[in-house]
């Protein structure tokens, strides 16, 4: 079975405020987003959508590698039964260790600065709160605590 | 196995209303954004509109704008379009599309309707 | 809207022999925090909606065969059928979803 078959519930990254860090006039955005008024706005409807959906493809294509012999180019999709939530063997992974590399080295102070969202998203899933507990797994596990404030701190001054 | 079933096509007369609907099963319908795409001989592919999972977005092609509304019943399954002030150049096979966890990425259509306009 | 042009408008090779599909955006899809080119191939058969084949420019979707493959970054992408099978007889598109979707025209693939 493809991906697309799971049941992972990918509407967490589907939110309807695109950006929930931002200040009252995104309000008024929200709702011409949702009366489909402005030709750019699905534009940067795609663009909200664009670093979180990379996140939820590595954590499902992380899960998707258990159930093959190796590692295909371009993480090749394999995907079985539903969502585990199992992120902790997900940054056991090489994907996302790059992932988080990448942001590391700097490119998330202009090119994602949606990744506080992701967080937050990430954290609200799950409502058995066994996720958010794999949460804290993660944040410590890649000593990111910091690099989450410092996220935090970017998004408030380097806003798109 | 994934199963998007269009149907309300048909001929109308131009000025006219019609609605469409597209009937999900085989995945959480309510989890997942959906698109309207439509196919012509002259035109191609040409994507028509999308609405967020849970409603809150919606979004149109300019070609359709003020004229076609999308809309969806998550405890039905079910993805509308209702389109009015029909013109000739609206002539073509409806699809509804599944988006995959990527945004605005197709992983599953429907087989399609044909809507055709004219008088 | 990003334009996507796609060559050859239509395309006859023999079977067993390599098929090469072109698409050209107007703009970049490459978004480059994660280095991934935001471009999908679909196949369409006769009577049949599109299928999805390949996204993000060269990753194949489960379930397509192997003899499919993508390339190509930034603008230039390309689509290759390394040996032709009957069942690959199919119109062939290309399209972004970087931005409001859009897809090339089509390529019409056929046995020589």
């Known amino acids: 079975r493809s991906l697309q078959d799971t049941e992972e519930k990918s509407r967490s990254f589907s939110a309807s405020q695109a950006d929930p860090l931002s200040d009252p006039d995104q309000m008024n955005e929200d709702k011409r987003h949702s009366q489909g008024t402005f030709t750019s706005d699905y534009s940067k409807y795609l663009d909200s959508r664009r670093a979180q959906d990379f996140v939820q493809w590595l954590m499902n294509t992380k899960r998707n590698r258990n159930n093959i012999a190796k590692r295909h180019d371009e993480f090749e999709r394999h995907a079985e039964g539903t969502f585990t939530s199992d992120v902790s063997s997900y940054l056991e992974g090489q994907a996302a260790k790059e992932f988080i590399a990448w942001l590391v080295k700097g490119r998330g102070r202009r090119d994602f600065p949606e990744e506080v969202a992701i967080v937050e998203e990430l954290g609200r899933r799950h409502a058995d709160g066994s996720f958010s507990d794999e949460m804290n797994t993660i944040l410590d596990n890649l000593a990111a605590r910091d690099f989450i404030n410092w996220l935090i701190q970017t998004k408030i001054t380097d806003r798109k | 196995q994934v199963q998007l079933v269009e149907s309300g096509g048909g001929v109308v007369q131009p000025g006219r209303s019609l609605r469409l609907s597209c009937a999900a099963s085989?995945?959480?319908?309510?989890?997942?954004?959906m698109h309207w795409v439509r196919q012509t001989p002259g035109k191609g592919l040409e994507w028509v509109a999308f609405i967020s999972y849970d409603g809150n977005n919606k979004y149109y092609a300019d070609s359709v704008k003020g004229r076609f509304t999308i809309s969806r019943d998550n405890s039905k399954n079910t993805l509308f379009l209702q389109m009015n002030s029909l013109r000739a150049e609206d002539t073509a096979v409806y699809y509804c599309?599944?988006?995959?966890?990527?945004?605005?990425?197709?992983?599953?259509w429907g087989q399609g309707t044909l809507v055709t306009v004219s008088s | 809207d990003i334009v996507m042009t796609q060559s050859p408008d239509s395309l006859a090779v023999s079977l067993g022999e390599r098929a090469t599909i072109n698409c050209k955006s107007s703009q970049s899809v490459l978004y480059s925090s994660n280095n991934k080119n935001y471009l999908a191939w679909y196949q369409q058969k006769p009577g049949q909606p599109p299928k999805l084949l390949i996204y993000w420019a060269s990753t194949r979707e489960s379930g397509v065969p192997d003899r499919f493959s993508g390339s190509g970054s930034g603008t230039d992408f390309t689509l290759t059928i390394s040996s032709l099978q009957a069942e690959d007889v199919a119109l062939y598109y290309c399209?972004?979803?970087?931005?409001?979707?859009?897809f090339g025209q089509g390529t019409k693939l056929e046995i020589k």
């Open positions: 085989g995945f959480t319908f309510s989890s997942y954004g």
């Open positions: 599309a599944k988006e995959s966890i990527l945004a605005a990425l197709f992983d599953y």
């Open positions: 399209q972004q979803y970087y931005n409001t979707p859009t």
